[in-house]
């Protein structure tokens, strides 16, 4: 008799999930020799332990603490780049500007980037068929709780000037319901963070509007100011040119506004 299995609304665990996590950990330690002390098998065991045999709607930040401990990493606190709804450009930027870090440039963010995972209550199986959707099923699912946990820790570690890349093509340039809006903004430490500088990335070639005047940006400014953190905003009219100028800052065309 086949065992009844909960059918969730979201996609199931990414195929080859255990192999991918382990391989990414090994890759990360090869690329970042300062993390060579990390035992990747222990990292996988801790990752697995956070969600295996647990109800996928009943995951807590506590479940991820052993993994957080193993993945403890010091990044320069004044070189943090947050992003919302514009991950690819943020990653392209830190690939060029090597001294800046997104969450996905840290071990834990790198391990989980673009992956989905969940288990089942009382069985050691990974569910490859379906996992809970944040909206339709539950918010305390393994993936959402993981990102909430690592995002909170990442924001708490930030200091001095923190940058955030925002997507100017979205109807809500700043979205209170995004991870940035709901977690990171509220966990920046006013005693450490002096300024949050938003970079609003324009989508259209001919878009010359000042998106820093957008109502959602004003809302972000209000939230940040109330937390005793200064706020500044820049329009990035030409993201392609912006990246090019990060690569070659001495280029003569890079003195004009980008």
């Amino acid at each position: 008799v086949p065992r009844w299995r909960q059918q969730w609304s979201g996609p199931g665990t990414t195929k080859r999930f255990p192999e991918t996590v382990l391989a990414r950990c090994v890759k990360y330690t090869e690329i970042h020799p300062e993390m060579r002390h990390v035992d990747c098998q222990s990292v996988w065991d801790a990752f697995k332990g956070a969600f295996i045999s647990k109800h996928p709607c009943n995951i807590t930040e506590e479940d991820y603490q052993p993994l957080m401990k193993l993945g403890t990493q010091t990044v320069p606190c004044n070189k943090i780049l947050l992003w919302s709804r514009i991950k690819d450009l943020a990653h392209q930027f830190t690939q060029v500007q090597r001294d800046m870090f997104t969450l996905e440039d840290t071990l834990l963010g790198y391990l989980a980037d673009d992956l989905t995972w969940c288990g089942e209550f009382n069985t050691s199986k990974i569910n490859y068929q379906s996992c809970p959707d944040w909206r339709k099923d539950c918010s305390n699912n393994p993936v959402s709780v993981f990102w909430k946990t690592v995002s909170r820790r990442f924001a708490e570690a930030a200091c001095d000037v923190v940058h955030v890349m925002l997507n100017g093509s979205r109807s809500k340039i700043f979205d209170k319901n995004s991870t940035f809006g709901s977690v990171e903004v509220h966990n920046l430490q006013p005693e450490k963070v002096q300024t949050l500088e938003a970079w609003v990335i324009h989508g259209g070639r001919e878009d010359s509007r000042d998106l820093c005047q957008d109502p959602t940006i004003k809302e972000l400014e209000s939230i940040i100011s109330k937390r005793n953190i200064q706020f500044s905003c820049k329009n990035i009219y030409r993201p392609d040119k912006f990246l090019q100028c990060v690569k070659n800052p001495e280029d003569s065309s890079c003195t004009s506004e980008i």
Partner: antibody
Amino acid sequence: EVQLVQSGAEVKKPGATVKISCKVSGYTFTDSVMNWVQQGPGKGLEWMGWIDPEYGRTDVAEKFQGRVTITADTSTDTAYMELSSLRSEDTAVYYCARTGYQSGYGFPYWGQGTTVTVSS
Amino acid sequence: DIQMTQSPSSLSASVGDRVTITCKASQNVDSDVDWYQQKPGKAPKLLIYKASNRYTGVPSRFSGSGSGTDFTFTISSLQPEDIATYYCMQSNTHPRTFGGGTKVEIK
């Protein structure tokens, strides 16, 4: 069985560009970083850079920056190393190489090498 | 960059002899040193990883030791098939760097 198979020998003129390929089999391409190593005639080995095929992230040794581009095509499980503005001292054998799970951070897996000759 | 100074650059020994090659790193590399054997026209072959671990299938006559800045590679009893050039490589920091190589010949 892990295999790294490189493209054939190339003869190029000074100032030209060469692009060498390294096609892998026997493992999941995105699971490992791919490195490139240069060996001049009668000379030692020099690490050039790496690519993480999963994300396209690269790192190139300072000596080669600006002239070396490392790319990967995950649809064909192939890594590429492009060297531009060729000069006579770029005449060398170029290898792709990767680490293994039971080899620390050494390179147990190597391509057979691609000989590039730069001559006018 | 970390310099790896390998010595000697060449040596000649008899079959059955004990052969020792040294590598000195310009700064601490922990135990992240690997040793390779390369025969003419062939790709290098990993013999020793992390200073002292023999890679799978490597004969027991090959060994390595050391940590920090000083490393030693030993062939306990030289065989005719061991004629090759041997390289050390530090894998502790980027860029990875190799020693200049030691060419081993039979007397």
